[in-house]
Interface confidence: low
């Protein structure tokens, strides 16, 4: 039957469709195609006569139709006015008709839509916002994200005008959140930018910190109060009823007993209109005077200073205490205490060494501490380190390396390659390297305050083919079902795949086995003897690849349990005895004897010439491996019957 | 992030002069090289001149000795190009490259500026 498919059904504006005519029959005359779902000669597109190759525009042939031989109708640059049907019209050689009719839709390519909103500072648990998707279109979907996400489930959220426009009711500061709508229909989809919706609230109920409410007298009182409120609250301070000051920070300093009272935090959000304030009650008590520290070395050196650390001021009668890091002084032959406590010398400081240090003042009711003191040992450089840690490069990157020592003060840092001074900088930078820029880069580090410098020198290599690699080993002789190995391929490069290969296959699917460091690692966990394979690993980038040679893991294994050959326990007087003895095992194990428990030699083959039945027994072969500490043994019956006898018969009487 | 950005080229007529600027950031000329390479249409790219400010030394190709200068003034991270004497084959885009401290390989380049000699 003859059939019209339209390619494709939903047209966008300005494409292009596809008429396409399925079984058309033999022996034409001709064709017409129609706009509309019928024959009607004023909505003739076009006429086509096969016998003269002749196609003939009608009263609807706008000049954007393509008519094929085989029947099939091409319409290009698409309008709004071309949806609906299409009639063919076959006329057959026997001058017999035949009809059929096909469709499609044309729709607009969607402009970008924008998000207008009717409330641009809504005011929460108050106000509801409309968002509105721009422009109006017909025939188009409308959805909306929030945060990319679709939108949650909310009895405070409401979809109106065919989804145009999304209400949000008593909007919450949760609701400070990025929009967009997106419109669709069956030709395009387009997405807004986002509008951020800026919910104005609060200001809640402020909280005042410290939350002690105790101070003693010569202390600082420092308050801070902070409300949760969109736009920031505006605070102000009260003591005692009366207005202090308009700051979110409330300082008096060496405060009094006559500092006493109620300090009230009042946060103001002058958007929203709203008050909060939260009220606070402060004692201070008269107290001794507070300790300080003082100290004899206030930049010692590393390994090389003693510091005296001393409790001021000096009082009679008075206990005084230390604390390291906030604990008790630790016991150690490098803290020495005066015999008044007053003095904590601390012997040849190290780094671990700054503190900080508090000493305190015992009196009747507490402790006074002093304030924390931290001490600023100089020390380093220790050895610097170079990062990243890549010894290979491809040519036209940048180079960028970055040195690192431990030091106080900090170290300055110079650069050098092959021996040449290149910048005092801790980073150095080459941009779009060459094969040229291969060499020995040796980072220095200074100290200035010790004067002590340190080195370190990193091979670079810089080459377009990347270097045969090699593989490394934290373990040349693993211990089979006990160790694991860890094989790694050198060097570490950059923008680099690694790829192992085990007897020449790519790895095989195992728990035992596992990959790590981007591929560079691959390690054998619980190693057995079959694991003694050649290992190879690649190396390859956009340009080159290279193997390296096989590495054959080593693994100790054994030693099994041995086995006695031949097998016969049988034999005839006059006979002579060889017994050789077996065991799987690497390294070769040693091998020992006992005939009836009596030690005999270590070979591996015990040899007695022309037996007899004194020689009847047990014989035991015992097998040890030095190397994975391991012993085995096997125990075989031997009987010898004298000459004339069969083996295994008893003799008759 | 390393930038080098040209100014100072135009329209001048044979005989005349212009002086070409060269602004970096993202690193200090005075650790490095830097040169001017010109590209005209159907020619080699040519390095015309180059400076490395860390041991003062400068180079200049035979087609532009005694007609062009190369300087750099490290305090303003900028290097100079002063052309006297123009000439019609000296028409091109100019480009500032970082030339590098160990071998001299212009290979990092700005966007260019056009320098066009024509009466």
């Known amino acids: 039957k003859l059939t019209i498919e339209s390619t494709p059904f939903n047209v966008a504006e300005g494409k292009e469709v596809l008429l396409l005519v399925h079984n058309l029959p033999q022996h034409l005359f001709g064709y017409s195609w129609y706009k509309g779902e019928r024959v009607d000669g004023n909505r003739q597109i076009i006429g086509y006569v096969i016998g003269t190759q002749q196609a003939t525009p009608g009263p609807a042939y706008s000049g954007r139709e393509i008519i094929y031989p085989n029947a099939s109708l091409l319409i290009q640059n698409i309008i709004q006015n071309d949806t609906g049907f299409y009639t063919l019209h076959v006329i057959k050689s026997d001058l017999v008709n035949e009809e059929a009719t096909g469709q499609f839709r044309v729709y607009p390519e969607l402009p970008k839509p924008s998000i207008s909103s009717n409330n641009s500072k809504p005011v929460e648990d108050k106000d509801a916002v409309a968002f509105t998707c721009e422009p109006e279109t017909q025939d188009a979907t409308y959805l909306w994200w929030v945060n990319n996400q679709s939108l949650p489930v909310s009895p405070r959220l409401q979809l109106s005008n065919g989804n145009r426009t999304l209400t949000l009711f008593n909007v919450t500061r949760n609701d400070t959140a990025s929009y967009k709508c997106e419109t669709q229909n069956p030709v395009s989809a387009r997405r807004s930018d986002s509008v951020i919706l800026n919910v104005l609230y609060g200001p809640d109920a402020p909280t005042i910190s410290p939350l002690n409410t105790s101070y003693r007298s010569g202390e600082n009182l420092n308050l801070s109060c902070h409300a949760a409120s969109n736009p920031p609250a505006q605070y102000s301070w009260f003591v005692n009823g009366t207005f202090q000051q308009s700051t979110q920070e409330l300082f008096i300093p060496n405060i009094t007993v006559n500092n006493s009272g109620s300090y009230t935090c009042q946060a103001h959000n002058s958007d929203t209109g709203l008050n909060r304030t939260t009220v606070t009650t402060i004692t201070v008590y008269a107290e001794p005077p507070k300790p300080f520290i003082t100290s004899n070395n206030s930049n010692p050196v590393e390994d090389e200073d003693a510091v005296a650390l001393t409790c001021e001021p000096e009082i009679q009668n008075t206990t005084y205490l230390w604390w390291v890091n906030n604990q008790s002084l630790p016991v150690s032959p490098r803290l020495q205490l005066s015999n008044d406590n007053r003095t904590l010398t601390l012997l040849s400081v190290t780094r671990n060494d700054v503190g900080p240090y508090e000493c305190g003042i015992q009196n009747e009711l507490s402790v006074d501490h002093s304030d924390p003191v931290i001490l600023n040992v100089l020390y380093g450089p220790d050895d610097p380190t170079i990062s990243p840690s890549y010894t290979y490069y491809r040519p036209g990157v940048n180079l960028s390396l970055s040195c690192h020592a431990a030091s106080n003060p900090p170290a300055q840092y110079s650069w050098l390659i092959d021996g040449n001074i290149q910048q005092h900088t801790q980073e150095l930078f080459i941009s779009n390297i060459t094969e040229k820029n291969s060499g020995l880069y040796t980072c220095q580090a200074n100290n200035s305050a010790s004067g002590h410098s340190r080195t370190t020198v990193k091979t670079i290599t810089v080459s377009a083919e990347l270097p045969k690699p090699s593989i490394s080993s934290n373990n040349s002789k693993p211990v089979e079902d006990k160790d694991a190995v860890a094989f790694t391929c050198e060097p570490e490069a950059q923008n680099t795949t690694y790829l192992w290969w085990v007897n020449g296959q790519s790895l095989p699917v195992s728990p035992r086995l596992q990959l790590s460091n981007g591929n560079r690692t691959l390690t054998l966990f619980n190693v057995t003897r079959n694991d003694a394979r050649a290992y190879v690993c690649g190396i390859q980038n956009s340009v080159s690849a290279n193997r390296s040679d096989p590495v054959t893991l080593d693994v100790l294994y054994g030693p099994d349990t041995p086995i006695i050959s031949p097998p016969d326990s049988s034999y005839l007087s006059g006979a002579n005895l060889n017994l050789s003895c077996h065991s799987a095992s690497n390294p070769s194990p040693q091998y020992s004897w006992r005939i009836n428990g009596i030690p005999q030699q270590h070979t591996q083959v015990l040899f007695i010439a022309k037996i007899t039945p004194n020689n009847n027994g047990t014989y035991a072969c015992f097998v040890s491996n030095l190397a994975t500490g391991r012993n085995n043994s096997i125990v075989k019956s031997i009987t010898v019957s004298a000459s004339g006898t069969s083996p295994g018969l008893s003799a008759g009487a | 992030e390393v930038q080098l950005v040209e100014s100072g080229g135009g329209l001048v007529q044979p005989g005349g002069s212009l002086r070409l600027s060269c602004a970096a950031s993202?690193?200090?000329?005075?650790?490095?090289?830097i040169g001017w390479v010109r590209r005209a249409p159907g020619k080699e790219e040519e390095l015309v001149a180059d400076?490395?400010?860390?041991?003062?030394?400068?180079r200049y190709a035979d087609s532009v000795k005694g007609r062009f200068t190369i300087s750099a003034d490290t305090s303003k991270n900028t290097a100079y190009l002063q052309m006297n004497s123009l000439r019609a084959e000296d028409t091109a885009v100019y480009y500032c490259?970082?030339?590098?401290?160990?071998?001299?390989?212009?290979?990092?380049w700005g966007q260019g500026t056009t320098v066009t000699v024509s009466s």
């Open positions: 400076i490395c400010p860390y041991k003062g030394s400068t």
């Open positions: 490259a970082i030339v590098s401290a160990r071998d001299g390989y212009y290979n990092y």
């Open positions: 993202g690193f200090n000329i005075k650790d490095t090289c």
